[in-house]
């Protein structure tokens, strides 16, 4: 889409509500394999004071534990600071608050730096619609198609959702 466009005026609050994880990608495949630290699944999100609060589901011992995390705002509108398995610079990469959200994180843990990307959608029945956008963002940030893992219902703790 070339040219200039009018944009909406809403804020982070538009991201609030239920989300479903659809795909993960990383330059360190172990991080997003089963039992990897970043094989986690979004449950819901809310925004307050410019910070993002997320409830995530973490597979543990055959069950899923819900954990609350807060990503704190920075001077850059699409960047947040998150502490989870080390320090993360979390970036919103592409967003349609009614449909999908793509974020990526630069994780620093024990002097090791990793890149993890995450695609989430509002409506799981439309997940295929947004995989091309995820692949495009992954390309932008230096991840390849073969570094993407598309999740199945079994993967994403569906049974743990309210």
């Amino acid at each position: 889409q070339e040219g200039n466009h009018e944009e909406p005026q809403g804020g982070l609050e538009e991201l609030s509500g239920r989300w479903h994880s659809v795909a993960l990608a990383s330059n360190k495949s172990d991080l997003i394999k089963p039992w990897g630290h970043f094989r986690v699944f979004i449950h819901s999100m809310s925004a307050k004071d410019g910070n993002l609060h997320g409830d995530i589901l973490i597979p543990q011992d055959g069950q899923c534990e819900k954990v609350s995390l807060t990503a704190f705002k920075t001077a850059t509108s699409n960047k947040f600071d998150l502490e989870y398995w080390g320090h993360n610079d979390l970036y919103l990469a592409e967003v349609d608050p009614k449909s999908y959200l793509i974020l990526y994180m630069i994780n620093q843990y024990n002097d090791d730096t990793s890149l993890v990307a995450h695609l989430m959608v509002r409506d799981l029945s439309r997940q295929q619609d947004f995989l091309p956008a995820f692949e495009s963002v992954c390309e932008d940030i230096g991840l390849h198609k073969d570094q993407i893992v598309v999740l199945s219902d079994d993967d994403r703790c569906q049974g743990s959702r309210d």
Epitope: H5, E7, Q9, T76, S77, N78, L92, A93, V95, D140
Partner: nanobody, 117 residues
Framework: QVQLVESGGGGVQAGGSLRLSCVAS????????MGWYRQAPGRQRELVAT???????NYADSVKGRFTISRDNAKNTVHLSMDSLNVEDTAVYFC???????????WGQGTQVTVSS
């Protein structure tokens, strides 16, 4: 309405340097990718360099080692420092930004860079 405004173009002798700048207006959730493309007469627009929010860069092979892209996320600005310019670098240089909002792509009006031998 999103606008990208370029500056810094002009004429220079081969071997010289120029620095292009681009300021983007505030956008919903900001920009994930910013960068520069160029178009020489009779040719298609081509990538010069891009930089993502986290600082990762991508350069066209023809400019690697000569051009450096940088960015100030808080100010929505992107710069392109061009050294060791040669005649083949003559083109209109377009600022590019990919917004977080819907992944929309935006372009500046372009700034002329002319390198003479």
């Amino acid at each position: 309405q999103v606008q990208l405004v370029e500056s810094g173009g002009g004429g220079v002798q081969a071997g010289g340097s120029l620095r292009l700048s681009c300021v983007a207006s505030q956008s919903h959730f900001g920009y994930n990718v910013m960068g520069w493309y160029r178009q020489a007469p009779g040719r298609q627009r081509e990538l010069v360099a891009t930089i993502i929010s986290s600082g990762g860069t991508n350069y066209a092979d023809s400019v690697k080692g000569r051009f450096t892209i940088s960015r100030d996320n808080a100010k929505n600005t992107v710069h392109l420092s061009m050294d060791s310019l040669n005649v083949e670098d003559t083109a209109v240089y377009f600022c590019y930004a990919k917004g977080v909002w819907l992944g929309r792509e935006y372009w500046g009006q372009g700034t002329q860079v002319t390198v003479s031998s």
